[in-house]
């Protein structure tokens, strides 16, 4: 229903706390360089204005759209052109073009320093002094680094953060209470960020239909007892929620997500037997819980689907009459039978089925043509299964760090032109798939591995789009989203690449490396490994292992030495010489 004042409507629905949080996230995701204080001031002004509209919906400007109100605020920021360059040109446009322009200027890799966590005492002091400001800083810092972070989910993580600080700041040993808990939240939030970015990419590049197909597959796996009409309704609603968040309409997105959660909890009987625990929780926790609820028990006696989709004489007639509905039903029926497949795989199978019908229904004898379609799925199913087996075996043998290094070598050989920091980030993220997925039960491994890899590779594509350097990467990134992972997996050594000349300074290290945290040490070593591969793309695994073991030994020796600086300056050049010889 239409409201006289959109801003009053959203303020009333969301309540002041969530309203302010979402406005802060929106501003931080649009203008990623502004300080917290600048944004906090804008948020307060918008909130005060919303309150006047709640009191009187006919007050001046209360009838304006949220895009108009927010855009006007952003465009009134002093020194916009000095700080944001051509983004200021967006302000010369009218809505809806102005908002589209803002969206296009979101930066997936902003040049901001890493978000450093203060030490425990300092954190607890500032949290106790002003919890609201502390949480505001958290929302601002995460949102500006992750401009597509799913806003209502970010509110959930802020709530988690709040609960952890409340608990741990009351403990004697704050540090050992905070560190593992906050690390856990950070890890989950980072995964949430890449997953949501993938959804927005799907929406931006391929439209709502592509996202809805993803949603149908995912929901059918999770709710195999729900009928097709129910799955379609949930997929349609979920598509709307994600479209709004990806489009910067965060107040509408959060409001609609709350509505969807309410609907699911009121209709558990027709959706799933597993929802009650989630539905007992407060709003943010409830919506989060529903988004990752365990799969319902599969029905006991689902028939084979060949009867309706291959053997039925009316297949082409049914397909021609309502293509999307017919394909949607196929995707639903296949997905509810296969919670052990990744969504990407299910979408590839549906795409193959669609292509087969397009071809066969135009022929003289369609049934003879499409009769073998389900058997033709087998290689498509075996490929990711083999990928999971091979990679999980390797992970179990090497551990996370060794597995990351193996992936780093592989991907540097596939795309040596890509910048070393991007390769290291990608390999470290791809390597975490082992820890995340390989320890799961057999039937959960494939969906975990492939859908996570797809999300990480989406980020590789986004970073590469900014500065395209590798034809291999461009080729894999320009295809459909679901074909990306198989495309990257199939890449081999880039034969067109001219090896980098050996620069001693790339492999020269100083004693400051000794005091770095373990993670930073690993990144330094992995940076060196990528550079070695760029110098010798065809180096064998044994050669690289020899060099890396030597390197690790060198660091260990010099970091234990009484005079570290002397050790690094004398042993360093020897290491470089040995490396050159080992790779000759």
């Amino acid at each position: 229903e239409a409201h006289k004042s959109e801003i009053a409507h959203r303020y009333n629905d969301l309540g002041e706390q969530h309203f302010k949080g979402l406005v802060l996230i929106a501003f931080s995701q649009y203008l990623q360089k502004c300080s917290y204080d600048e944004h906090a001031k804008l948020v307060q002004e918008v909130t005060d204005f919303a309150k006047t509209c709640v009191a009187d919906e006919s007050a001046a400007n209360c009838d304006k759209s949220l895009h108009t109100l927010f855009g006007d605020k952003l465009c009134a920021i002093p020194n916009l052109r000095e700080n944001y360059g051509e983004l200021a040109d967006c302000c010369t446009k009218q809505e809806p073009e102005r908002n589209e322009c803002f969206l296009q200027h979101k930066d997936d890799n902003p040049s901001l320093p890493p978000f450093e966590r203060p030490e425990a005492e300092a954190m607890c002091t500032s949290f106790k002094e002003n919890p609201t400001t502390f949480m505001g800083h958290y929302l601002h810092e995460v949102a500006r680094r992750h401009p597509y972070f799913y806003a209502p989910e970010l509110l959930y993580y802020a709530e988690q953060y709040n609960e952890i600080l409340t608990q741990c700041c009351a403990e004697a040993d704050k540090e050992s209470c905070l560190t593992p808990k906050l690390d856990g939240v950070k890890e989950k939030a980072l995964v949430s960020s890449v997953r949501q970015r993938m959804k927005c990419s799907s929406m931006q590049k391929f439209g709502e239909r592509a996202f809805k197909a993803w949603a149908v597959a995912r929901l059918s796996q999770t709710f195999p007892n729900a009928d097709f009409a129910e799955i379609t309704k949930l997929a349609t609603d979920l598509t709307k929620v994600n479209k709004e968040c990806c489009h910067g309409d965060l107040l509408e997105c959060a409001d609609d997500r709350a509505e969807l959660a309410k609907y699911m909890c009121e209709n558990q009987a027709t959706i799933s037997s597993k929802l009650q625990t989630c539905c007992d929780k407060p709003l943010l926790k409830k919506a989060h819980c529903l988004s990752e609820v365990e799969h319902d028990t599969m029905p006991a006696d689902l028939p084979a689907i060949a009867a309706d989709f291959v053997e039925d004489q009316e297949v082409c007639k049914n397909y021609a009459e309502a293509k999307d509905v017919f394909l949607g039903t196929f995707l639903y029926e296949y997905s509810r039978r296969h919670p052990d497949y990744s969504v990407s795989l299910l979408l590839r199978l549906a795409k193959k089925y669609e292509a087969t019908l397009e071809k066969c229904c135009a022929e003289a004898n369609p049934p003879a043509c499409y009769g073998t379609v389900l058997a033709e799925f087998q290689p498509l199913v075996e490929e990711p299964k083999n990928l999971v087996k091979t990679n999980c075996d390797l992970y179990e043998k090497l551990g996370e760090y060794g597995f990351q290094n193996a992936i780093l070598v592989r991907y540097t050989q596939k795309a040596p032109q890509v910048s070393t920091p991007t390769l290291v980030e990608a390999a470290r993220n791809l390597g975490r798939v082992g820890t995340k997925c390989c320890t799961l039960p057999e039937d959960q491994r494939l969906p975990c591995v492939e859908d996570y890899l797809s999300a990480i590779l989406n980020r590789v594509c986004l970073l590469h789009e900014k500065t395209p350097v590798s034809e291999h990467v461009t080729k894999c990134c320009s295809g459909s989203l679901v074909e990306r992972r198989p495309c990257f997996s199939a890449l081999t050594v880039d034969e067109t690449y001219v090896p980098k000349e050996f620069k001693a300074e790339t492999f020269t290290f100083h004693s400051d490396i000794c005091t770095l945290p373990e993670k930073e040490k690993q990144i330094k070593k992995q940076t060196a490994l990528a550079e070695l591969v760029k110098h010798k793309p065809k180096a064998t695994a044994e050669q690289l292992k020899t060099v890396m073991d030597d390197f690790a030994q060198f660091l260990d020796t010099c970091c234990k030495a009484a005079d570290k600086d002397t050790c690094f300056s004398t042993e360093g050049p020897n290491l470089v010489t040995r490396c050159k010889d080992a790779l000759a």
């Epitope: 006991a300 389900l374 799925f377 087998q378």
Partner: nanobody, 115 residues
Framework: QVQLVESGGGLVQPGGSLRLSCSAS????????MGWYRQAPGKQRELVAS???????HYADTVKGRFTISRDNSKNTLYLQMNSLEPEDTAVYYC?????????WGQGTQVTVSS
């Protein structure tokens, strides 16, 4: 071509136990359902127990607590452990394996519970 072979049936006294096996040969991929069905003389074939790809098990009310279904993925084999057998369990037991493309049935193995 997929072939399913059941074994382990036989004559047993009431209160006794049997373990049925069903092994699949040939190429069957993408299995989402494995089940045991039975058919007593003059009756419809009925589901006894099934196990889905996610490991969920389902049992007919009449066998709950007495029968246990399990599978060995590496051997493509399905089992049915039957304890506390009753004369009403007398039937031909069939195993059924499904992927989206088809429904594969064994020839059946006779189970007779009688004193």
């Amino acid at each position: 071509q997929v072939q399913l072979v059941e074994s382990g049936g036989g004559l047993v006294q009431p209160g006794g136990s049997l373990r049925l096996s069903c092994s699949a040969s040939g190429s069957i991929w993408g299995i989402y359902h494995m089940g045991w069905y039975r058919q007593a003389p003059g009756k419809q074939r009925e589901l006894v127990a099934s196990i889905t790809v996610d490991g969920s098990t389902h049992y007919a009310d009449t066998v709950k607590g007495r029968f246990t279904i399990s599978r060995d993925n590496s051997k493509n084999t399905l089992y049915l452990q039957m304890n506390s057998l009753e004369p009403e369990d007398t039937a031909v037991y069939y195993c059924d394996i499904r992927n989206v493309g088809g429904d594969y049935w064994g020839q059946g193995t006779q189970v007779t519970v009688s004193s």
